[in-house]
Structure formats: C-alpha cells, structure tokens
C-alpha cells in the first residue's frame, strides 16, 4: 500500500453568501490526522499518533496552510454563479501518494453539494468531468476562476502536487508513520439470541495496515457470507482500526466454532468461551 | 462404528438425472457437516459439494454449479446429491464424506462409493 | 480456485525407507490442509489434519509439516501397507480442493 496524505476541505454558501468558517480534515495513511475547526482555524492532530508524528512543537504552519487553503476554496465558491437558496456547500479533496517503487500520484476533486463536478491529475494537469450537464456547467465555472487565480496568487493552487508531497515526506520522516505491523487483539464473546442459539461475536482492535482477513469457521471450514454479519473496518482513534464479524450458532456447539483472523501474514484461531458466563441481552445482572 | 452406505449410482445418458443418496449411521447425523467427492476412472479425488449442519452453508465445485444440488433429511441420517444436466465428464465414483468435529475442514469418514456412469 | 500440485507424481521406494511428498498450494492456505491415503478399489483415509496433526490411530511414523503455501508428507519408515496413493486437500477457500496425488509403489 502506499503511503497517502488526503486534504478534505468544507466551505459553506448560505443564500449566495459565503461563510467563513470551514472545516479541514487531513488523513495520514488513512488515518484521522489533523483537523481545522470551523471558525477559528487551529491545526488539531488526532490522538496522540497525530502528536507523535508532529513531535513536539506549534501547529503554526499546518494552521497557516490550512487557514490559506480555507481562504482560497471561499474564493472560489464565491465565483460558482446561480447559486439557488438555502445551503450549498463545495467540497475540495486532495490526495498524494508516494508508492513502494518512489512513484508518485497526486489528484485533486471538487464537490458541490457533495456531488463530483471537477477532478485533476496534478501531476498531468489533466481535467476531467462528469457527463452531467450540471455537473459540466460548474467545472466551466471553477475551471475559469482557477486558471485567472493561478495567475494572481501562489497560495492554494500553486505547485499543489509538489507542496502535498513535501508535507507527506516531512511526516514520513517522524518515523512513526514508516511502513509498520500492529498485530490486533481478538475478543470473542457470546450473548443470548433466542431460545437455543446464542450470537457469538469475534472484535478485532488496534491493528494496522486496515487489510484484515475475519471470518466464522465451523470444523475449519468458513461459513457462508449470509450467515455472517461483519462490521466496516474503522480508524479507533489511535492510528490503528478496529472491526467485528458475528455469527448465530446452536448452544451446544461452541466448540465447533471459531473466530479466524489472518493480517499481514500472521494467523490466528479463536474459540467462543465456554458458557458458564454469559452476556445477557437485558438491563438485569 | 460410523458407516456411510451411498445408493442411487448408476447408468445414465447425457443430459439425464440422477440422484444419490448417503444413509448414516454411528454417529449423531445431524450435527455433521457432509460432502460429496467424486473420483473418475483411474483419476484423483475431485471435491462436489459440501452441506453443513442445519443445511445453513452450502458450497459446490464450479465445475457442478447449477446443475447439482446437495441436501440432507437428519431426520433420516441421509445426505443427497440430485444431478441434473449430466455429462460424460461426470462419470465417476461418488463419495459421501463427513466432515471432522473441530478439523480443518477434514474428511474423517467416507462411504465405499456408488458409480455413475454417464454414456450414451 | 486454489490450485495444489503434488511433487512427485509417483515414487518407487522399499520397506523401511523415509519417503517425502510436497504439496504447493497456488495461494496462501495457512495451515488448513489435509493428508489422505487410498488404497484400489478402497475409500480415503485421513492421516494428518491442519498441516501437522496427527489423526487418531494413525501411525506415528507418519507426520505432516509446513504452513502458508509449502506442505510436507513424510513416512518416516515405509511399511508394506503404505503402498498407496497420498493426496493433500485444502479447506483454506470454500472451493475445497485435492491435489493430483503421489503414488508410492514397491522399488
């Protein structure tokens, strides 16, 4: 997997006007990395992962860039003519990413009322629209005022793709973020279904990379995808994820039953406890 | 002593049906996971099917898909395989196989095996 | 589907030598293959379950090694009664699939 750092920008319009708060996510490796608050802009890192790559220092320019990236997205919504009542929102999301073999890829997408209108390749420069005449018309739009504000200001659009990987490689340089394994701890546990079955629940934590193999198995053998029920695989919050599979199974038969897990090459198996113990579904002791 | 006894072998032409059938005893049917294996002429052994407890997984070889069908009756310990759509390729000696208690995925006991033969 | 190829196809060998066979396996199947033997004209029988385990009244001459994509069979003193062929199965995928088989025949 590649090494990845994504900007999400927010601005808001309310009845043609623009507001000015916005909202700036930043991820690191598809982690929750930075964040800038609506009014006030001050680089937030995301746990203390987010710290750790940082180190121990002011999030000035991190606020400054974002504050200048914030800045320029207003300006542009502000050019999107015919913008009807109520809220509208442009959305502007920037990734670049470095590969194992030094490659590089940078885009940049743009997003009006959570709908793709605009993308560019920042390393090509080139664009490319949906086929939606609306879609069309705002790309025309943004498009233009792009290319006169790239003539009058250095700020946003300037040499995107290279600023993006500047900041990725600066990040990568901390340590914290090289290419690393955090084996996850499984939990299983079991709680009353119905009369004779019981719902087992297999939690996968603190792992990372994301890709992670969890899956229900009666005498080894996998259970069908219907009769499993799996959780997305989230950021925890700590620069790990977390996710869940659970299974219904006749009471009785636990033992048949195990949790497999299998993540960056290591592979584990996982019965359901014994049923001396049980989490009950209800509010009593 | 755990017996698998398959039935229903036979000659067919192709295109034709047949149905086979596994009647166990030994052992507690229902709570067994069962499969078909399948073993032509002077050839290995080739997977079918498999059927867990409660019929709740069902799995097949793509090379039957859609034209076999596996399902069990643990009220009558039998496990069975209706083939439909013959063809010469599926001439072979059919093995009901059940699945070991907390294996991996093994195949613990099998039938003597009933022979199909598909010809016109 | 997870193919698995055996190697060798067949080996001539005499009572009491140590014979090995391989199992590839074309993808990672961790630890979830299965050793058969078959006898003509008899139905398989299970000698080693998830790589390395012993089924229960085989004999110990017989052992099973390796995970992820390389298996090994190994009789570590042939008796006459081990005259067969040898298949490794794997259960990793729900497309369970046997390999071609060894054969062991007297030298």
């Known amino acids: 997997e590649p090494h990845s750092l994504r900007y999400n920008l927010t601005v808001l319009s309310w009845d043609g006007s623009v507001q000015s708060g916005f909202l700036t996510e930043v991820h690191l490796d598809g982690q929750p990395f930075l964040r800038c608050d609506r009014q006030k802009c001050r680089a937030k890192p995301q746990g203390q992962w987010a710290e750790d790559v940082l180190g121990n220092k002011t999030w000035d320019r991190e606020t400054r860039d974002l504050t200048g990236n914030g800045k320029d997205l207003r300006m542009t919504l502000a050019h999107i003519k015919d913008q009807k009542e109520g809220l509208h929102s442009l959305q502007e999301i920037r990734v670049c990413e470095i590969h194992e073999d030094n490659s590089t890829r940078s885009s940049q997408h743009f997003y009006y009322d959570g709908e793709l209108f605009l993308s560019q390749n920042l390393e090509t420069k080139e664009w490319t629209m949906p086929q939606s005449s609306r879609a069309q018309t705002l790309a025309m739009n943004v498009r233009n005022f792009l290319k006169e504000d790239a003539m009058k200001t250095k700020t946003h659009y300037h040499a995107m793709h290279a600023d993006c990987l500047q900041e990725l490689r600066r990040y990568l340089k901390s340590g914290v973020v090289l290419r690393r394994t955090v084996p996850p701890m499984v939990n299983v546990t079991r709680s009353e279904a119905s009369e004779g079955n019981i719902t087992v629940t297999c939690r996968a934590s603190g792992f990372y990379p994301w890709n992670i193999t969890l899956s229900w198995r009666q005498d080894g053998v996998s259970l069908s995808h219907d009769t499993q029920q799996w959780g997305d695989v989230l950021p925890d919050g700590n620069g790990t994820y977390q996710t869940w599979v659970a299974t219904r199974i006749c009471q009785g038969e636990e033992q048949r039953f195990t949790c497999y897990m299998e993540h960056s090459g290591n592979h584990s198996t996982h019965p359901v406890p014994s049923g001396k113990v049980l989490v009950l579904q209800s509010h009593w002791q | 002593e755990v017996q698998l006894v398959e039935s229903g072998g036979g000659l067919v032409q192709p295109g034709g049906s047949l149905r086979l059938s596994c009647a166990a005893s030994?052992?507690?049917?229902?709570?067994?996971?069962m499969n078909w294996v399948r073993q032509a002429p002077g050839k290995g052994l080739e997977w079918v099917s498999y059927?867990?407890?409660?019929?709740?997984?069902?799995y097949y070889a793509d090379s039957v898909k859609g034209r076999f069908t596996i399902s069990r009756d643990d009220a009558r310990k039998s496990l069975y395989l209706q083939m439909n759509s013959l063809r010469d390729e599926d001439t072979a000696v059919y093995y009901c196989a059940r699945v070991m208690v907390r294996g991996s995925g093994t195949f613990d006991y099998w039938g003597q095996g009933t022979l199909v033969t598909v010809s016109s | 589907d997870i193919q698995m190829t055996q190697s060798p196809s067949s080996l001539s060998a005499s009572v009491g030598d140590r014979v090995t066979i391989t199992c590839r396996a074309s993808?990672?199947?961790?630890?979830?293959l299965n050793w058969y033997q078959q006898k003509p004209g008899k139905d398989p029988k299970v000698l080693i379950f998830a790589a390395s385990s012993l089924q229960s009244g085989v004999p110990s001459r017989f052992s099973g090694s390796g995970s992820g994509t390389d298996f090994t069979l190994t009789i570590s003193s042939l008796q006459p009664e081990d005259f067969a062929t040898y298949y490794c199965?794997?259960?990793?995928?729900?497309?369970?699939?046997f390999g071609p088989g060894t054969k062991v025949d007297i030298k």
């Open positions: 059927i867990s407890t409660r019929s709740s997984t069902i």
């Open positions: 993808q990672s199947i961790t630890y979830f």
């Open positions: 030994g052992f507690t049917f229902s709570t067994y996971s």
């Open positions: 199965q794997q259960s990793y995928s729900t497309r369970f699939t």
